[in-house]
Interface confidence: medium
């Protein structure tokens, strides 16, 4: 119980005091306050909210609260020239047009500045052509189309359903397939849970609802015009042609009412199998083009959005540490929303606000954490994690030397079934121990721990009696801290039952219907799940900032490294002949993992025994723990992804949201049977095994006795 030993501690000022100060009613009040108008990045409304949060954090008692601004590339629809899609007849007349906006929810009819649905960073264009339905537009969907069905998407407009993978990956795949435009839509199979009413009568997506979102492929670059460096006053900006990650073809999102009109006329090939059928009453024919009677009709896109360099504002609050002020524990979540942000991000921002208030209350009573806590309200997350990335680029030298941990705080809920945690293996034991001390908010688990309900509802696939904890991927503001800088990171939220709800995310994600009422009426009327998430996020920050010894267990990294090595080896072993031909061996990797395991075990033994009253030795041991995550960083980055530098984890090349283990080896092996030069391809596999083995061995040595 190391927290109670922190400096200036009185019996009152422990983790319990911090947790007891967190109140569901406050979170509810903050959520309401943050969701009454839109807070789109780059707008005056979001600047005003930044100043309000700055003022309130100061009132709560933080030592300093500053705004950090950057001028980054954002994207907006043209207010006088709206985006839409039409069906045109042989004379070029528009016989059907998609809707220009979502019908506003009750009570919000007179709200101004609701940005209509658009795909941020789409280039302008008015392509017309035949439609091809490409399912989810995943890598495997295009393999099915091109290789098995011999359907050529070149010069076609593709229509893809949202879900399964990040929308930017869908657009990248469509571009590579030669498409000249992309239509994204929400199918009820993915965004309508059976038996639940659509908003405002329930939490399902109505037919006119549309998911907004950026379609970039930044690969961790941040602002597309200033990759690697902050977008400050004296920044050198690339020309738009050299900008990182921008799509090259027009893209636009629609709802399922409009999708029905496009899909019901589709002809050409039948869907290859049932996994290509959604839940609209249409044949889900792949195309290309419309069926018999409608074969002369085409689809035309009208996209007029513009990219603009715009000022954004992060709010950075500091609570100075009493003993190790040069060690930073960071709690950050974004503030910008697509519209009202009822869930994304304000359910998270409201929790951060209450955590700041609780810490501030303790500080006013004379307490300080051992280490410095930084609180961040990030801007422009929705436009590519821009606020967090620019700040981290500006402060990278400090962060890589002083960063202990980063806890992310976007949406607190995506359901109300059980806890969901993604984090570095270093934090597994912290999360386990913390959740054992917290009460479960779940029905049927009264008087039981959060750990118990979580484990029951979301069991680990590998270890019985333990809950599932997932790998970190991307798509949120931890990316730069973890994937680029190698700072131990974690995230927690309440989620849905993935077994019974197969829809992607939550149905109203990034739509106008993501309101305060959605949360208050349907997801969490008592705000008990929000409170639990506040306790988890806040509790992690408290322990990370206050424990005498950092609450990291390096042995858990050893366990997963072995698991990941086994997994990548088994993928490679699908090609036994080639492994023999090209002398591909994983011995070096397994040897490095074995060494890591032994050294981590010895380090853990020393950690139990060392003299904690010796501040030099304590600092030395803590630094070895802090820098372990950093040791997995390869300064050269992954191939073609220089800002993804973590050798053990990276966002999947096929889905930014998902984490991939040993990503360098994985990508080298992916679809290797189709490579034109197998010798070169297997040579790259060998090189990636070498990089991984070296990195694991080098990381292990950072845990060895220093002399």
């Amino acid at each position: 119980k190391s927290s109670n030993e922190a400096t200036n501690i009185t019996p009152k000022h422990n983790m319990k005091a911090f947790l007891d100060e967190l109140k569901a009613e406050n979170i509810k009040k903050f959520l309401y306050n943050f969701t009454q108008i839109p807070h789109l990045a780059g707008t005056e409304q979001n600047f005003q909210l930044a100043k309000q949060i700055q003022s309130q954090w100061k009132e709560f008692g933080l030592d300093s609260v500053e705004l950090a601004h950057y001028d980054v590339l954002l994207s907006y629809p043209n207010k006088t020239h709206p985006n839409y899609i039409s069906i045109i007849n042989e004379d070029g007349n528009e016989i059907f047009n998609t809707s220009l906006f979502e019908p506003p929810p009750p009570g919000y009819e007179n709200v101004s500045d609701i940005v209509p649905p658009f795909s941020a960073f789409s280039p302008q264009g008015m392509p017309e052509g035949d439609l091809v339905y490409v399912n989810y537009a995943r890598t495997e969907d295009f393999f099915k189309l091109e290789r098995d069905m011999k359907i050529n998407c070149s010069g076609k407009i593709v229509i893809a359903r949202y879900g399964k993978v990040f929308r930017g990956n869908k657009v990248k795949n469509a571009q590579l397939a030669g498409a000249k435009g992309v239509i994204l839509y929400s199918d009820p199979a993915d965004y309508f849970a059976p038996g639940v009413k659509s908003y405002p009568d329930g939490w399902n997506l109505p037919g006119g609802g549309v998911q907004r979102g950026n379609i970039l492929n930044l690969n961790g670059a941040g602002d597309p015009l200033t990759p690697g460096y902050p977008a400050n006053e004296y920044a050198y900006r690339r020309g738009i042609a050299e900008a990182v990650g921008l799509p090259s073809i027009p893209v636009h999102p629609i709802g399922y009412y409009d999708a029905q009109k496009l899909l019901e006329k589709m002809g050409g090939s039948a869907p290859p199998d049932s996994s290509w059928r959604g839940s609209l009453k249409v044949p889900y024919n792949v195309g290309p083009g419309f069926t018999g009677n409608f074969s002369t009709q085409k689809v035309k896109m009208h996209i007029h959005s513009t990219n603009e360099v715009t000022r954004i504002y992060n709010v950075i609050g500091t609570l100075r540490g009493a003993v190790e002020p040069d060690r930073y524990v960071i709690l950050g979540g974004h503030r910008d929303s697509w519209v009202f942000g009822g869930i994304d991000p304000q359910s998270g921002a409201a929790v951060v606000h209450e955590i700041v208030r609780s810490f501030g209350t303790l500080k006013k009573e004379g307490w300080r954490p051992r280490r410095t806590i930084l609180f961040a309200s990030w801007d422009a997350e929705e436009f590519g994690l821009l606020g967090s990335t620019e700040w981290a680029e500006e402060n990278s030298r400090l962060l890589q030397e002083r960063g202990v941990a980063y806890i992310n705080a976007d949406s607190s809920i995506e359901g109300n079934y059980t806890l969901r945690v993604d984090c570095t293996p270093l934090m597994y034991s912290l999360v386990h121990n913390l959740t054992k001390e917290l009460k479960s908010p779940d029905e049927g688990f009264e008087g039981k721990s959060l750990y118990e309900s979580w484990t029951k509802k979301s069991p680990s696939p590998e270890f019985s009696g333990m809950p599932r904890i997932s790998k970190l991927g991307s798509g949120n503001d931890f990316e730069v801290f973890f994937q680029r800088l190698g700072i131990a990171s974690g995230r927690a939220r309440y989620t849905k039952n993935w077994e019974t709800n197969k829809f992607s995310g939550y149905p109203l994600y990034h739509s106008v219907y993501e309101t305060y009422e959605l949360v208050e009426k349907f997801y969490d009327p008592m705000f008990k799940y929000h409170l639990t998430v506040a306790q988890v996020r806040g509790g992690m920050v408290f322990e990370l900032a206050n424990s005498i010894v950092l609450p990291f267990d390096c042995r858990d990294y050893a366990v997963v490294l072995r698991k990941y090595a086994d997994k990548i080896y088994s993928i490679s072993m699908k090609h036994p002949q080639e492994m023999k031909t090209y002398s591909v061996s994983f011995d070096s990797l397994f040897s490095a993992v074995k060494n890591f395991t032994e050294i981590a075990s010895k380090f853990s033994e020393r950690l139990q025994d060392f003299d904690k009253s010796n501040p030099i030795v304590l600092r030395m041991m803590n630094d070895q723990l802090m820098f372990l995550e950093r040791a997995f960083i390869d300064p050269l980055g992954l191939p073609d992804r220089p800002f993804y530098r973590h050798v053990i984890y990276a966002p999947s090349s096929h889905n930014k949201y998902a984490g991939e283990s040993f990503p360098g080896i994985y990508d080298a092996l992916f679809d290797i049977e189709s490579k034109v030069d197998p010798s070169k391809a297997w040579g790259e596999v060998k090189r990636q095994i070498y990089v991984a083995a070296f990195t694991v061995q080098a990381a292990a040595e950072t845990l060895s006795e220093v002399a």
């Epitope: 059976p194 037919g207 839940s279 044949p283």
Partner: antibody, heavy 124, light 109 residues
Framework: QVQLVQSGGGLVQPGGSLRLSCAAS????????MSWVRQAPGKGLEWVAN????????YYVDSVKGRFTISRDNAKNSLYLQMNSLRAEDTAVYYC?????????????????WGQGTMVTVSS | AIRMTQSPSSVSASVGDRVTITCRAS??????LAWYQQKPGKAPKLLIY???SLQSGVPSRFSGSGSGTDFTLTISSLKPEDFATYYC???????????FGGGTKVEIK
Amino acid sequence: QVQLVQSGGGLVQPGGSLRLSCAASGFTFSSYWMSWVRQAPGKGLEWVANIKQDGSEKYYVDSVKGRFTISRDNAKNSLYLQMNSLRAEDTAVYYCARVWDYYYDSSGDAFDIWGQGTMVTVSS
Amino acid sequence: AIRMTQSPSSVSASVGDRVTITCRASQGISSWLAWYQQKPGKAPKLLIYAASSLQSGVPSRFSGSGSGTDFTLTISSLKPEDFATYYCQQANSFPRALTFGGGTKVEIK
């Protein structure tokens, strides 16, 4: 509680008319498609007609088109079936039923609430 | 119009038996299928929707499966109250048309 209560059945001669009524309670009647389903003696179920929430769309099985009219009065929470030019083969128990749009707006997939049924006998 | 063919038209079974009823659509209907139970002199009762989703309050011994053209209703262990007639119904062509299968009577052996 949620229920549908029917009235208006009876014996009628071929060529005659009859009006069936269905009173809804316990739910927001105006939010649902509604239907009539019938069952001839000793036979299976046959869908007869559908009407949209606001009455703007109506659909009928081929065998009753031009003879039967489905209608609703949302202010009275009531559904109606006006049956004209009745034939012997129209003899059946008629059920009103709520169409549950469980999958997405107006997809109308299953009949989750049924009336108790009313017998219509067409005979000379 | 979509035709729904149920088989068998009747089945004799004992309490505790596993009973399987099939329904075939004349063309693909995705998962737009519901199953009903009807007892003599009573209105039908919804058991399964979306081919496999159990309606609230229906015992878990009832289950549905299938997609496209072939569907199955299974009663895992027959109870005395399960002796009735069962109907499938497609809604792929809603709202223009709805079709029921001919029914399967589950009788006491």
